[in-house]
Interface confidence: low
Amino acid sequence: MLRRRGSPGMGVHVGAALGALWFCLTGALEVQVPEDPVVALVGTDATLCCSFSPEPGFSLAQLNLIWQLTDTKQLVHSFAEGQDQGSAYANRTALFPDLLAQGNASLRLQRVRVADEGSFTCFVSIRDFGSAAVSLQVAAPYSKPSMTLEPNKDLRPGDTVTITCSSYQGYPEAEVFWQDGQGVPLTGNVTTSQMANEQGLFDVHSILRVVLGANGTYSCLVRNPVLQQDAHSSVTITPQRSPTGAVEVQVPEDPVVALVGTDATLRCSFSPEPGFSLAQLNLIWQLTDTKQLVHSFTEGRDQGSAYANRTALFPDLLAQGNASLRLQRVRVADEGSFTCFVSIRDFGSAAVSLQVAAPYSKPSMTLEPNKDLRPGDTVTITCSSYRGYPEAEVFWQDGQGVPLTGNVTTSQMANEQGLFDVHSVLRVVLGANGTYSCLVRNPVLQQDAHGSVTITGQPMTFPPEALWVTVGLSVCLIALLVALAFVCWRKIKQSCEEENAGAEDQDGEGEGSKTALQPLKHSDSKEDDGQEIA
C-alpha cells in the first residue's frame, strides 16, 4: 500500500555489519508516500501524503523539507531552519505545521487545476535524507449530457435526424457510447469531438445520424475513465405533429442531475402561438411544493431571481419558446421539484425534478492494528470516502471477488453543506494473506469509487530494528564464546606443559634452558609469555 524509499547510499557490505547495526539503531530515514495516484477533483483541495520516521530527540530545527515537481525539479514548497518557507507554487500549497514534528510532511494543494497533474517529490533531510514521489491524477466529472435534435419539429418516420450529445467541463478525455432503446450499441454514423478549454477541461460533442422509425429512444453515455463516472441522457422521438393553438409546456421526464457547485439548466419549452410577442408572455418558475417564487418574466421584462440570486433565464431564446432556467452553484438544499408555469392567452405548466449529486472521493483504507500482523489475528479495516451525495452504497469483497457481508458496520454523516462522509468498518480474521476491497457507489451518478488493501501475514519476520539488534547480539555472543573457548584451551595447554616441564627436570639438568625458551618461540601474547616464564 505504501511505497517506501530509504535514503541514497544505504547499501552496506557484509564486512561493515557492525557499522550498519549502529546505522539502523540510530534510525535510517524512511520517506513514505501512497503507491496509488492521489485523485483530486478540479477546484477542490488535495493532500499529497508524505511521512518520515523522525529520530529520537528530533526537533523541527533540524528538518529540511522540500516538495518539488519530479520532472522539472521546480520548487513547490519548503521548510528549513525551523520555519515554513512558504509556497513557491502560485500560493496554493501549505504544509501541516502541527503535524511535522510527528513525521507528517504532507502537502495541501488548494484549488487543484488540470495543469497540476503529475508527479511531486517529497524530499526530507535531517541527518540522513530520503525522498519519494507521489502522483497527482486530476479529474473533473462530466456534466449530464444535453441532447439536441436537428431538425426538431415536423418529424415523420423515414426522416434522417442528427442527434447531438454534449457534455461539458470534464477531465480527462471521455469515452462516449451510444445505444438504442433496447440497449443495442450504435456505432455507425457517430462522430465525436473533444475540445479542451483554457483550464484544460474537455467539452465533448458526439453526433449520431439516424433514420427515424415509428418512434425510438437514443441514449448517449459519457464516461470519465478516471472517476469511473458515467453520465447519460436519452431522447425519445415520436414523429407526430403537436396540435396547434394550445400552449404546450414541455420539460424533461427524467430528473435533471446536477453536481454540487456546478450550474444546472432546468429545461422548459412552450409552443408560441403565431404572432406571439414577449410582451404577452407571463412566465413563473416556482418550487412545486411550497409555491415559493424562484424567477419570473412579466410585462415583457425579466423580473429577476427571487432565489438567492442564483437563477437566470435565457432572454435571447424566450421568443422561440425556450423558458429554461439556469440555476447557478447548485447546493444539496436545491434538490426537489421546480414548476415552469407559462401563460399567454392559453396557459400551461409542468414540473421538472432536480436531483443533486456529488461524487465520492477515492476511499482511503486504514488498518487497526497495522503492524506485527499474523494469520489468525482479527483486524479492523476502515474504508472512508468523503463529500458525496446522495448517501452511498458500500460493498466489501475479498481478492476473489466474493462479497463480504458479515461484520460490516457502515455510517454516513452529512456535513453542513449536506454532503456525506461515509465510513465503513470490516472486521476480519487474517488468513496467510488476503486482499480486501471496498466499493463506494453513488447511486445517482452510478459512480463507483474503490479502494483495496492487501495484507500479508508474516509469522516469523521482525521489524528491521529488531532484526539488527538480534544480529548484533548474536555476533557479540559468538565472539564471547570463541574468546572463552580460547582462554580455556590456553589454560589446559599451560597446565599440560607445566607437567611435562616437571618431568624433564627430573630426567636431566642440561635440558632446562631449552625447555624454558621453547614456550617463548610459540607465544601469542606478552601476557602469555609472562605466564609461561613464571
Epitope: N91, R92, R111, A308, N309, R310, Q328, R329, R331
Partner: nanobody, 123 residues
C-alpha cells in the same frame, strides 16, 4: 467591477457595541468571500475577520475572536461586522474587501476595497 459602500461607523464609549455594514454592487455577491481589515493611526492595516461566500465559515484575528462577529445577508448583498465590548485600542478606520485567491488574513488576497469607515472608542 465590484463597488463596496460602507456605513455604521462613529464615536462610542468603551464597552459599547457597534455594527458596520458593507453593501456590494456590480457582481454576484453570493459567490464572494468577504473580509474586514482595520488601520489605526500610524499603524499598519491589520486583518480583523473574514466570511465565506455562503456564510458557513468565518475566520477571525486571534485577539478579536469572541468580541467581533462577521455575518452576511446575500439577499441584501451586504456583509456585517458586529463589534461588542469595544475598547479604546479598537479605534481605527475599518475597511471591508472582496477576497480573491490566497489566505483570508492576507491583504494581498483581496481584489476590491471599500472606502473605509472611522470607528472611535472613547475611554
Amino acid at each position: 467591477q465590484v463597488q463596496l459602500q460602507q456605513s455604521g461607523g462613529g464615536l462610542v464609549q468603551a464597552g459599547d457595541s457597534l455594527r458596520l455594514s458593507c453593501e456590494a454592487s456590480g457582481g454576484t455577491f453570493s459567490s464572494y468571500a468577504m473580509g474586514w481589515f482595520r488601520q489605526a493611526p500610524r499603524q499598519e492595516r491589520e486583518f480583523v475577520a473574514a466570511i465565506s461566500s455562503e456564510g458557513g465559515s468565518t475566520y477571525y484575528a486571534d485577539n478579536l475572536e469572541g468580541r467581533f462577529t462577521t455575518s452576511r445577508d446575500n439577499a441584501k448583498n451586504t456583509v456585517y461586522l458586529q463589534m461588542n465590548s469595544l475598547k479604546p485600542e479598537d479605534t481605527a478606520v475599518y475597511y471591508c474587501a472582496v477576497k480573491g485567491v490566497g489566505w483570508p488574513q492576507e491583504q494581498a488576497s483581496y481584489d476590491y476595497w471599500g472606502q473605509g469607515t472611522q470607528v472611535t472608542v472613547k475611554p
